[in-house]
């Protein structure tokens, strides 16, 4: 019977007695940047071609065996992960081993570079179709190697890589805390976050997503028949460079940006139990597990966007925290979220030709983060229209103005360290929904964007009695771009986009004052490109 | 043994082909920073990935490395190359003392410089 | 180009041992084992065991166990078959094929067994 | 061990015929099925491997089809040099095991 994790990413339209989806990866070359491996083990040969590529410290300890199959043992077993012709997820990649890992796991940042190296000149030399690196490996947060995988992304390269197995915030490892690196965690059978003895799989807003990596079935170094059973992040990362294989084999012209935003889109949502998370981390990690697309075609046609956090500014007064979008996404909208409540809102700036999202801290807080709204909007042209404080007591409002623009995002930054509460709220008038309202104290800032076929609308949710949590979500069809609190009293911790739900925190009900203070509105912007289809058409 | 000779010739050769006014000054207001593992059993100290400005030519990245094998032989300090990197990032990977990196952070075309670091399969 | 080229035909006595060769050529060794598949004359094809090049591990027919033996000399790139205690029904032509997947073979070694 | 069993055992056929062979295997072998070629006094060719698919420099007049335990080679118009025996492998299990054969002869 099919394995569970081969099982768990496959859609239901493909599930037969055997896993067997249309066209395994094979026009897909993928790079595994491992141990050696048994490359003429049943599940992998032919599959796999060993390079002579090897950069790996001497093993530790004076008394230790170099046994052959327990240094095959992880790039064996992750090899037929990926391409295996039984328990492998793309059975039709084809795959090419360098070994940065020694027969006891180790490896060096120095090692990993050289290899990575070697890939980019290899790829200069014979360019080939679409390229996957996997880097199932991890090592404290390194400056070097995270430029390195930067810098071979730019190059076409899609990089997936292994949160880690620390228990701990996968920022703070590398190449997991690249921006550009795909970062998969690991979940089991149950959907649940994988515990590996004491530790168990890393969290945290540098993770993209989750992947089955507990008891995954594999090759087993031990003979050239045998299967094992491993655990850990590699496990899980193996999966999702086997299914961006599978993407890419079916979309070969997938840029990184596109390749990210559709493994999010077909993720299965909300499954996994977020309990296990550290407290402060649970808004951070992505609730994601990796699956395959139901179906390539028709994908293009949708407007695809995702959410990215920005790391903690600190608790100074001034402390600011900056989301970007990856280089060919764009930032539809920006909000901001601190636990404390303290926080003086956020903006759109542009930043190297960019725009970025910015938040800032208040006198008093505990940090703020910043999060971006990254959207695939082929052909757009975005600006950011801004309105300072009003004096009138009707509250700031800025529109967009241009013919053509539709409104995407809004936000609001303030100077005052509190904006008054008492205040009663102002409400957006009806039948203009291309506008943001806000506090008469705050700057208002609208993200504002021509695309074809670009069509936005805006949906409200307000509760007018407290309450922690208030959601609003775009309906079928429709993406959220936008997502913010009407108007930004201060006891709203923030607002932040959950896959196609805009969420608004407000401090615990028990510490609000009256409930005409309580009332807190959601604000959704959702969109949809009409057009994709016709204009990718018509570019063609 | 053999090994450290050969090291000793290279430097030697790498003197006399170098003139002795030799540190240029990093260009005026950047200054290159160090960069080291937070997880110390991690550390790998001895070897430095040595980072230069993007638009380094794979010559300046060799010339910038021979540079600092001759400052340091000039200090007594034996070094070694081991890797010259281009096609990603230009740098170099040297083995070399820990006191040298205050020198090696002053060379024309310097970025940032790292000290190596272990990885583990996951 | 990717072959398998064997050593030529044999006339063992009952009782006798015969070793047959297989030198590869073309392709990259490490990634592929050797098959090893006998076909005795007018008779189907019976595979008889794998080696691998790469660390010179075995997996055996039930129906060899005990008499024959294979073996790799990856600086020749030469896998070898031996066969043991041989028996008139072990007249065969005896072929040696790349990996599991069986894509390419060798020419055939005819090994006769009579007194 | 997994029993496969072809048929015909040979058939008669000629020039710009189509042909077809089945293989049955005595228990499901998903589209583990590879087809082989032999021509007197010589090695056998693979011609389809994984029930379907034809390797580089094989004429697209042969073809596989089937999954679990029924399978068909077919030869959509015979030419000369297709005279020859055909083997089915089941390649699900170890060992890998062989149908008997089919002989196709000049009719």
């Known amino acids: 019977s099919i394995p569970w994790n081969l099982e768990r990413i496959t859609p239901p339209r493909y599930r037969a007695d055997e896993y067997q989806p249309p066209d395994g990866g094979s026009l897909v070359e993928v790079y595994l940047l491992d141990t050696s491996i048994q490359s003429d083990h049943r599940e992998i040969e032919g599959r796999v071609m060993v390079t002579d590529f090897e950069n790996v410290p001497e093993e530790d300890g004076t008394r230790f065996h170099r046994q052959a199959s327990k240094c095959d043992s992880h790039g064996t077993h992750l090899a037929g992960v990926v391409s295996g012709r039984d328990a492998g997820v793309a059975k039709g990649a084809s795959m090419r081993s360098l070994r940065v890992l020694n027969c006891q796991g180790k490896g060096t940042v120095s090692g990993t570079l050289i290899g990575l190296e070697f890939i980019r000149k290899s790829q200069l030399v014979q360019p080939v179709g679409p390229l996957v690196v996997l880097l199932p490996l991890a090592g404290g947060y390194s400056r070097v190697l995270n430029a390195a995988c930067q810098r071979l992304a730019r190059a076409g390269v899609v990089l997936v890589t292994a949160a880690g197995n620390f228990r701990d915030d996968a920022c703070l490892y590398s190449p997991a805390s690249a921006p550009e690196v795909i970062t998969v965690g690991a979940t089991n059978a149950q959907d649940q976050p994988v515990t590996l003895g004491t530790l168990g799989t890393n969290f945290g807003r540098c993770v993209d997503l989750f992947a089955p990596g507990e008891d995954i079935i594999g090759a087993s170094s031990d003979c050239s028949t045998c299967f094992v059973s491993q655990s850990g992040t590699s496990q899980a990362a193996a999966h999702v460079a086997g299914i961006a294989a599978m993407m890419l084999s079916a979309e070969p012209e997938l840029t990184l940006a596109e390749l990210r935003q559709r493994l999010i889109h077909f993720s299965a949502k909300d499954v996994i139990n977020e309990a296990w998370f550290p407290e402060d981390q649970r808004v951070l990690t992505p609730n994601l597990v990796a699956a395959l697309p139901p179906s390539t075609h028709g994908a293009g046609w949708q407007l695809f966007c995702r959410t990215v956090w920005s790391a903690h500014s600190g608790p100074t007064r001034m402390a600011t925290a900056v989301a970007r979008c990856a280089p060919d996404e764009e930032l539809l909208s920006c909000s901001s979220f601190s636990r404390s409540g303290k926080r003086r809102g956020e903006r759109m700036e542009a930043q190297g030709g960019k725009l970025v999202c910015r938040a800032h801290n208040a006198f008093g807080g505990e940090g703020v983060y910043a999060i971006a709204r990254c959207c695939l909007l082929p052909q757009a042209n975005c600006s950011v229209h801004t309105a300072p404080p009003a004096e009138a007591s009707m509250g700031t409002r800025v529109h967009c103005h241009q013919q053509g623009h539709v409104l995407t995002g809004c936000s609001s930054h303030w100077e005052v360290e509190d904006l008054g509460t008492h205040k009663p709220p102002v409400l957006r008038p009806r039948g203009q929904p291309n506008q943001c309202v806000g506090h008469r104290e705050a700057s208002i800032h609208a993200s504002c964007c021509h695309a074809p076929g670009l069509e936005c609308k805006v949906k409200e949710h307000g509760i007018p009695a407290p309450q922690e949590q208030v959601t609003v979500a775009c309906e079928e069809g429709w993406t959220l771009t936008g997502c913010s609190a009407l108007p930004g009293t201060s006891h709203v911790l923030g607002a932040y986009a959950v896959d196609n739900t805009c969420v608004v925190r407000s401090r615990d009900v028990s510490t609000t004052g009256s409930t005409s203070e309580g009332a807190v509105t959601a604000v959704a912007i959702c969109c949809r490109s009409r057009h994709l289809a016709q204009a990718s058409q018509e570019l063609q | 043994q053999e090994d450290e000779d050969g090291d000793y010739e290279e430097l030697v050769l790498a003197l006399r082909s170098e003139e002795d006014g030799l540190a240029e000054a990093p260009e005026h207001g950047t200054t290159a920073t160090f960069h080291r593992c937070a997880k110390d059993p991690w550390r790998l100290p001895g070897t430095y990935v040595v980072v230069l400005k993007e638009e380094t030519h794979l010559s300046q990245s060799e010339r910038t490395a021979r540079r600092l094998q001759a400052q340091a032989a000039r200090r007594g300090y034996l070094t070694k190359i081991l890797h010259v990197f281009h096609g990603l990032l230009p740098g170099f990977l040297v083995k070399m003392s820990g006191d040298l990196l205050e020198l090696a952070l002053k060379l024309p075309h310097v970025d940032y410089i790292e000290e190596d670091s272990s990885v583990f399969a996951q | 180009q990717v072959q398998l080229v064997q050593s030529g035909a044999e006339v063992k006595k009952p009782g006798a041992s015969v070793k047959v060769s297989c030198k590869a050529s073309g392709y990259a060794l490490y990634n592929y084992g050797i098959s090893w598949v006998r076909q005795a004359p007018g008779q189907g094809l019976e595979w008889m065991g794998w080696v691998s090049f790469y660390n010179g591990n075995t997996n055996y027919a039930q129906k060899l166990q005990g008499r024959g033996t294979m073996t790799t000399d990856p600086s020749t790139s030469t896998a070898y078959m031996e066969l043991r205690s041989l028996r008139s029904d072990d007249t065969a032509v005896y072929y040696c094929a790349r990996g599991y997947v069986m894509d390419i073979w060798g020419q055939g070694t005819t090994v006769t067994v009579s007194s | 061990d997994i029993q496969m069993t072809q048929s015909p055992s040979s058939l008669s056929a000629s020039v710009g015929d189509r042909v077809t062979i089945t293989c049955r295997a005595s228990?499901?072998?998903?589209?583990?099925l590879d087809w082989y070629q032999q021509k007197p006094g010589k090695a056998p060719k693979l011609l389809i491997y994984?029930?379907?698919t034809r390797p580089s420099g094989v004429p697209s007049r042969f073809s596989g089809s089937g999954s679990g335990t029924d399978f068909t080679l077919t030869i959509s118009s015979l030419q000369p040099e297709d005279f020859a025996t055909y083997y089915c492998q089941q390649d699900q299990d170890i060992p890998p095991t062989f149908g008997q054969g089919t002989k196709v002869e000049i009719k």
């Open positions: 994984a029930a379907s």
């Open positions: 228990q499901s072998i998903n589209n583990w």
